[in-house]
């Protein structure tokens, strides 16, 4: 008789999840000399221990503590790039501007990027059929708790000028319900962070509007100012040119506004 299995509304664990996490860990530690001491088998064991045999709607930050300990990594606090709804461009940017870091440029972020995972209460099985959806099922699911935890910690670690890349093509350029809006903004430390600088990325070729005047950006400015952090905003009218100019800052076309 097949055992009854909870059906969740979200997609199941990414196929070959254990192999993917282990392979990513090995690759990351090979590329980053400062993380060569990390034992990837222990990392996988700690990752697995955070959610295996636990109800996937009852995960806590503490469940991830052993993994966080193993993934401890000192990030240059003044080189942090946050992003919201524009991950690909943010990652393209840090691939060129190698001294800046998104969360996914850290070991922990790299391990989990674009993956889904969950287990089942009282069994050692990984659930490849379905996992809880944040809205339809529960917020304290393994994936959401992981990202909320590491996002909070990443924002806490920031100092001086913190940059955030925002998607100017979206109806809400700044969304209070995004991870950036609900977690990261509120965990910047005013004692350490002087300025939050938003880069609003334009989508349209002929879009010359000043999106820094958008009502949602004004809302972000208000939230940040109330936290005693200065706010500045820049339009990135041509993201393709922006990236090109990061690669080749001496290019003559890079003196004009991008």
């Amino acid at each position: 008789v097949p055992r009854w299995r909870q059906q969740w509304s979200g997609p199941g664990t990414t196929k070959r999840f254990p192999e993917t996490v282990l392979a990513r860990c090995v690759k990351y530690t090979e590329i980053h000399p400062e993380m060569r001491h990390v034992d990837c088998q222990s990392v996988w064991d700690a990752f697995k221990g955070a959610f295996i045999s636990k109800h996937p709607c009852n995960i806590t930050e503490e469940d991830y503590q052993p993994l966080m300990k193993l993934g401890t990594q000192t990030v240059p606090c003044n080189k942090i790039l946050l992003w919201s709804r524009i991950k690909d461009l943010a990652h393209q940017f840090t691939q060129v501007q190698r001294d800046m870091f998104t969360l996914e440029d850290t070991l922990l972020g790299y391990l989990a990027d674009d993956l889904t995972w969950c287990g089942e209460f009282n069994t050692s099985k990984i659930n490849y059929q379905s996992c809880p959806d944040w809205r339809k099922d529960c917020s304290n699911n393994p994936v959401s708790v992981f990202w909320k935890t590491v996002s909070r910690r990443f924002a806490e670690a920031a100092c001086d000028v913190v940059h955030v890349m925002l998607n100017g093509s979206r109806s809400k350029i700044f969304d209070k319900n995004s991870t950036f809006g609900s977690v990261e903004v509120h965990n910047l430390q005013p004692e350490k962070v002087q300025t939050l600088e938003a880069w609003v990325i334009h989508g349209g070729r002929e879009d010359s509007r000043d999106l820094c005047q958008d009502p949602t950006i004004k809302e972000l400015e208000s939230i940040i100012s109330k936290r005693n952090i200065q706010f500045s905003c820049k339009n990135i009218y041509r993201p393709d040119k922006f990236l090109q100019c990061v690669k080749n800052p001496e290019d003559s076309s890079c003196t004009s506004e991008i």
């Epitope: 930050e61 503490e62 993934g71 000192t74 922990l108 910690r153 806490e156 430390q189 350490k192």
Partner: nanobody, 116 residues
């Protein structure tokens, strides 16, 4: 730069109490998970008690019910109240501050000696 300074150690009789203090400077204490560790001669350093940035605590089985860890973020202080001390609690006690993206910091340690 980051400094953790322990104080409050000393010589005490079995059954007595001590309160260890850890003064932190150079960090925003509230974002760090704080811990007390101890190392007895010839033994590995072991976790005694820890308190997360959110205030959750955990203790080594050997000290549960006898030791209490607490923190005062406003004063940048962490405390370890040690009651019903036993000779086997004799060790150097170290304060630790940890943040996943800021790193791991240790104090110099304070000696606790429990005589029978």
């Amino acid at each position: 730069q980051v400094q953790l300074q322990e104080s409050g150690g000393g010589l005490v009789q079995a059954g007595g109490s001590l309160r260890l203090s850890c003064a932190a400077s150079g960090i925003i204490l509230r974002i760090y998970d704080m811990g007390w560790y101890r190392q007895a001669p010839g033994k590995q350093r072991e976790l005694v008690a820890a308190i997360t940035s959110g205030g959750s605590t955990n203790y080594a089985d050997s000290v549960k019910g006898r030791f209490t860890i607490s923190r005062d973020n406003a004063k940048s202080m962490v405390y370890l109240q040690m009651n019903s001390l036993k000779p086997e609690d004799t060790a150097v006690y170290y304060c630790n501050a940890w943040h996943v993206f800021r790193g791991n910091y240790w104090g110099q340690g304070t000696q606790v000696t429990v005589s029978s």
